[in-house]
Amino acid sequence: AAQPNNSLMLQTSKENHALASSSLCMDEKQITQNYSKVLAEVNTSWPVKMATNAVLCCPPIALRNLIIITWEIILRGQPSCTKAYRKETNETKETNCTDERITWVSRPDQNSDLQIRPVAITHDGYYRCIMVTPDGNFHRGYHLQVLVTPEVTLFQNRNRTAVCKAVAGKPAAQISWIPEGDCATKQEYWSNGTVTVKSTCHWEVHNVSTVTCHVSHLTGNKSLYIELLPVPGAKKSAKL
């Protein structure tokens, strides 16, 4: 059997409600009889864009071999939430689970996957599926990192000085300039975990007439340019 880490695939599709949906699930064809011998615990770091739907999967153990399926959800500043399903007696148990956006994909006796619809910034955390079988307990964990696309603005505020801002991104965006100038970068951290990055650059060299701000972020990159005018110019704004 392939090593679990090698066989994880990120799939993205469009749903009817126009929200992207992503999953790190195994294709059923990859489930092998000796998979349980390979799998002790798999932990995956998974960046997911805010406002998309996410599906988190359990280890690929045949449902007929299952006794209990448990999802443990540890979110920042909250008590650990557990959702457990006992197959034999068809019982579900939930403890400290208050977020209605985090649910079983369907009936847990048919599908052990967990879904987040839609992903919010508060869903940053650790998610672990524990499958109890006669051969032992098998785990798959996800360090879910919620990504927030920053809003990018570029404007001139003084003679030959431009300001590029990547507002409320998660994680913090990186700002670079072409050509390089005399720059100062500040980061402002917000209580919801987002970061605003502000880069202010000055160009003494008078032959520099156009400057480009390049914003790099896990959700995508964006470049804006501005002409350096003797007086402050028009404000440019864009979403990544």
């Epitope: 006794i67 209990i68 448990t70 443990e72 557990t82 457990a84 034999e88 007696t89 148990k93 939930e94 403890t95 400290n96 524990i130 109890v132 006669p134 307990n137």
Partner: antibody, heavy 120, light 106 residues
């Protein structure tokens, strides 16, 4: 250390009601299932029922459905068994036992038992 | 409800002797659980999921079976094994116990 501490010996009259307690330490009962089991003198074990303290969902054996009530108080980490309309047939030792809620598959910890005697 | 029938009800064994007791279910169950109880003590978990030994249970104990027929075996009887053993099913509510097998030391 996980422990289940049950109330002491109880003597009651026929027809009366009784409420037995089981106080847990070393774990939070809200995370688990709490069961009650009856054992009459020199006899076997009989399952009475269980509670999920997280939502107060209960299940009972048909035999005990009408006269047994299982409750839980998560603030005091205590499970209770109330028995009504007592007869001499209810004279027994009553055990509380837990099943760990996340991955537990069996009764892993038991209380020391409460001896209930119904006699006039 | 599922009825569990244990046999024998009473048995005795000498130290070193092999002991087998059975538990028969009135309908098929997925797993069997066993508990040991000594006089004036609470039951102790002994075997779970048919064949897994609970914490602290000596390796001379084993469990096996499937469907409606299950058994607990002691490969070599020791004095401390004298007790009553109960089987229990969790395949459907109500949960049920067998009437017990009392094992005495010869």
């Amino acid at each position: 250390e996980v422990q289940l501490q049950q109330s002491g010996t109880v003597l009651v009259r026929p027809g009366a009601s009784v409420k037995l307690s089981c106080t847990a330490s070393g774990f939070n009962i809200k995370d688990d299932y709490m069961h009650w089991v009856k054992q009459r003198p020199e006899q076997g074990l009989e399952w009475i029922g269980r509670i999920d303290p997280a939502n107060d969902n209960t299940k009972y054996a048909p035999k005990f459905q009408d006269r047994a009530t299982i409750t839980a108080d998560t603030s005091s980490n205590t499970a209770y068994l109330q028995l009504s309309s007592l007869t001499s047939e209810d004279t027994a030792v009553y055990y509380c036992t837990r099943v760990e809620g996340r991955t537990g598959t069996y009764f892993d910890y038991w209380g020391q038992g409460t001896t209930l005697t119904v006699s006039s | 409800q599922i009825v569990l029938t244990q046999s024998p009800a009473l048995t005795s064994a000498s130290p070193g002797e092999k002991v087998t007791m059975t538990c028969s279910a009135s309908s098929s169950v997925s797993y069997m659980y066993w508990f040991q109880q000594k006089p004036r003590s609470s039951p102790k978990p002994w075997i779970y999921l048919t064949s897994k030994l609970a914490s602290g249970v000596p390796a001379r104990f084993s469990g096996s079976g499937s469907g409606t027929s299950y058994s607990l075996t002691i490969s070599s009887m020791e004095a401390e094994d004298a007790a009553t053993y109960y089987c229990q099913q969790w395949s459907s509510y109500p949960l049920t116990f067998g009437a017990g097998t009392k094992l005495e030391l010869k």
